[in-house]
Interface confidence: medium
């Protein structure tokens, strides 16, 4: 069958999220990939959504994050949006009202978008052919 | 071609007022999400605060909070930031920038000078 259009969406978005460095994508976030055994794709889908959520959420305004030059605020700026993109996107494939975010373990942003990047391409491959 | 100009700024004493202006250009003002950005002597950016397109809601950082007041006027294509109870701390440059779309647009800056 067809991917969903917001498939589509979101490995665009993670394309240009993966593309470059920010003074904050080393800034580290709950790694909900450490133990996802036992977790739906829905579910997956809804934490990762929600660590996205907190992250942007801490960091929109953080004066390390925007930086000294008017290009690291622009590239900041431009990060939380991708972020806010990719939140959406995602809740809209979770389907989920909300979902608990409990693990102890901690990957940078860049490795938790990379490992979300693999799953999303793993599921396009799938339902594309 | 997009331009924001500010103005407004100066030298003022400490406690004193400034009312800060920035007109906007070569795109759809009432689409855009604007901020307030300073930067101090020798030091990096610091956000200031943020207004949404249709001037609802508004954003301020901790430091400026009570003190200044952000708004603007779409009919004119007018960007404000009224700063009030001024501190020496509060001495940077001034910028005016869109930071609600996919893209982002700088003005000049206006110097905000707090001394006795």
């Known amino acids: 069958h067809k991917c969903d259009i917001t498939l589509q969406e979101i490995i665009k978005t993670l394309n240009s999220l993966t593309e470059q460095k920010t003074l904050c994508t080393e800034l580290t976030v709950t790694d909900i990939f450490a133990a996802s055994k036992n977790t739906t794709e829905k579910e997956t889908f809804c934490r990762a959504a929600t660590v996205l959520r907190q992250f942007y959420s801490h960091h929109e305004k953080d004066t390390r994050c925007l930086g000294a030059t008017a290009q690291q605020f622009h590239r900041h700026k431009q990060l939380i949006r991708f972020l806010k993109r990719l939140d959406r996107n995602l809740w809209g494939l979770a389907g989920l009202n909300s979902c608990p975010v409990k693990e102890a373990n901690q990957s940078t942003l860049e490795n938790f978008l990379e490992r979300l990047k693999t799953i999303m391409r793993e599921k396009y491959s799938k339902c594309s052919s | 071609e997009v331009q924001l100009l500010e103005s407004g700024g100066g030298l003022v004493q400490p406690g004193g007022s400034l009312r800060l202006s920035c007109a906007a250009s070569?795109?759809?003002?009432?689409?855009?999400?604007m901020s307030w950005v300073r930067q101090a002597p020798g030091k990096g950016l610091e956000w200031v605060s943020e207004i949404t397109a249709g001037g609802v809601i508004t954003y301020y950082a901790d430091s400026v909070k009570g003190r200044f007041t952000i708004s603007r006027d779409n009919s004119k294509n007018t960007l404000y930031l009224q700063m009030n109870s001024l501190r020496a701390e509060d001495t940077a440059v001034y910028y005016c920038a869109t930071t609600g779309s996919d893209f982002d647009y700088w003005g000049q800056g206006t110097l905000v000078t707090v001394s006795s």
């Open positions: 070569g795109f759809t003002f009432d689409d855009e999400m």
